[in-house]
Interface confidence: medium
């Protein structure tokens, strides 16, 4: 059946060194356990995280994300997932695309991650 993929309509913000959570869901909600779910960086299509055949496909990840991502799947049976990126770097800032693929049917949603420096401040003087 057909569905839409929905991500946040505003930039997700995270501090360098912290975690970022990028949410994504399908609408109408349905069980996505058997689907392929993933995130890639726009516009270079580098794989950030991939879930396929009921498992995270760590070997498919771009090297700069290896060991730093986690797909939160507690609500995947309702078509809702969240990608957690740990130890956020400045280089993580930019566009991401989340996709759900059910057999030959695939839909995507774009989202943006803004990375901020926790130590940046403006001298009021």
């Amino acid at each position: 059946g057909q569905f839409r993929v929905i991500g946040p309509g505003y930039p997700i913000r995270a501090l360098v060194g912290d975690e970022a959570e990028l949410p994504c869901r399908i609408s109408p909600g349905k069980n996505a356990t058997g689907m392929e779910v993933g995130w890639y960086r726009s516009p270079f299509s580098r794989v950030v995280h991939l879930y396929r055949n009921g498992k995270d496909q760590d070997a498919e990840q771009a090297p700069e994300y290896r060991g730093r991502t986690e797909l939160l799947k507690e609500t995947i049976s309702e078509g809702k997932v969240t990608l957690r990126i740990q130890n956020v770097r400045f280089s993580d800032e930019g566009g991401y695309t989340c996709f759900f693929r059910d057999h030959s049917y695939q839909e995507e949603a774009a989202m943006e991650l803004k990375v901020e420096d926790p130590f940046y401040w403006v001298n009021p003087g």
Epitope: R4, G7, P8, G9, P23, S27, G29, E74, T75, T82
Partner: antibody, heavy 122, light 107 residues
């Protein structure tokens, strides 16, 4: 079956305080954001506050900011609303509602409690 | 804040009628709109989310459409249990806001 049961409502004088609780069951409480929505007698719905799945992010309507505090105890499957400096215009039925998603990315509500009436009057 | 305006505020209809309720947002909200049904003394019940997705367990006579600023809830054939008040809600940006409600009464 999802159940949300609010308690703690009642009659309070202007300037007083009240703490509402919402006991949740039938779903993985720690995986969902939660909200409070109120309805003044004979009026429409007004969103009050919400909190993400972990409790680390909270948002408030301007009308209650600085006076109300939302919190949660995931180990007890309970949502709270601490209401201070209450005013007559806070009189309403307060509903606890389960957000459709786990983090605050646009909240709508797929399950609601039965509500608890808060009356602020001298 | 985004202001949600529903029309009409109330309407009278008969069982079997097709009923349409509209909701207009003061600025674009994409498809971030939900519809609820509320009966007297009861909590609201989610009918439609993402402007057009039917909530599980809700009868197919309910449908939603629209995007941007103009949205519609349609009941294709009104049933006795559908007499209630209907609210739209935007979840595009804080604070989440509701329409003032549309009361559907028996003619």
């Amino acid at each position: 079956e999802v159940q949300l049961v609010e308690t703690g409502g009642g009659l309070v004088q202007p300037g007083g305080s009240l703490r509402l609780s919402c006991a949740a069951s039938g779903f993985t409480f720690s995986s969902y954001a939660m909200s409070w929505v109120r309805q003044a007698p004979g009026k429409g719905l007004e969103w009050v506050s919400d909190i993400n799945h972990s409790g680390g992010s909270t948002y408030y309507a301007d009308s209650v900011k600085g006076r109300f505090t939302i919190s949660r105890d995931n180990s007890k499957h309970t949502l709270y609303l601490q209401m201070n400096s209450l005013r007559a215009e806070d009189t309403a039925v307060y509903y606890c509602a389960k957000d459709y998603y786990d983090i605050l990315t646009g909240s709508f509500f797929d399950y609601w409690g039965q509500g608890t009436l808060v009356t602020v009057s001298s | 804040d985004i202001v949600m305006t529903q029309s009409p505020s109330s309407l009278s209809a008969s069982v079997g009628d097709r009923v349409t309720i509209t909701c207009r947002a003061s600025q674009g909200i994409s498809s971030a709109l939900a519809w609820y049904q509320q009966k007297p003394g009861k909590a609201p019940k989610l009918l439609i989310y993402d402007a057009s997705s039917l909530e599980s367990g809700v009868p197919s006579r309910f449908s939603g459409s629209g995007s941007g600023t103009d949205f519609t809830l349609t009941i294709s054939s009104l049933q006795p249990e559908d007499f209630a008040t209907y609210y739209c809600q935007q979840f595009n940006s804080y604070p989440w806001t509701f329409g003032q409600g549309t009361k559907v009464e028996i003619k």
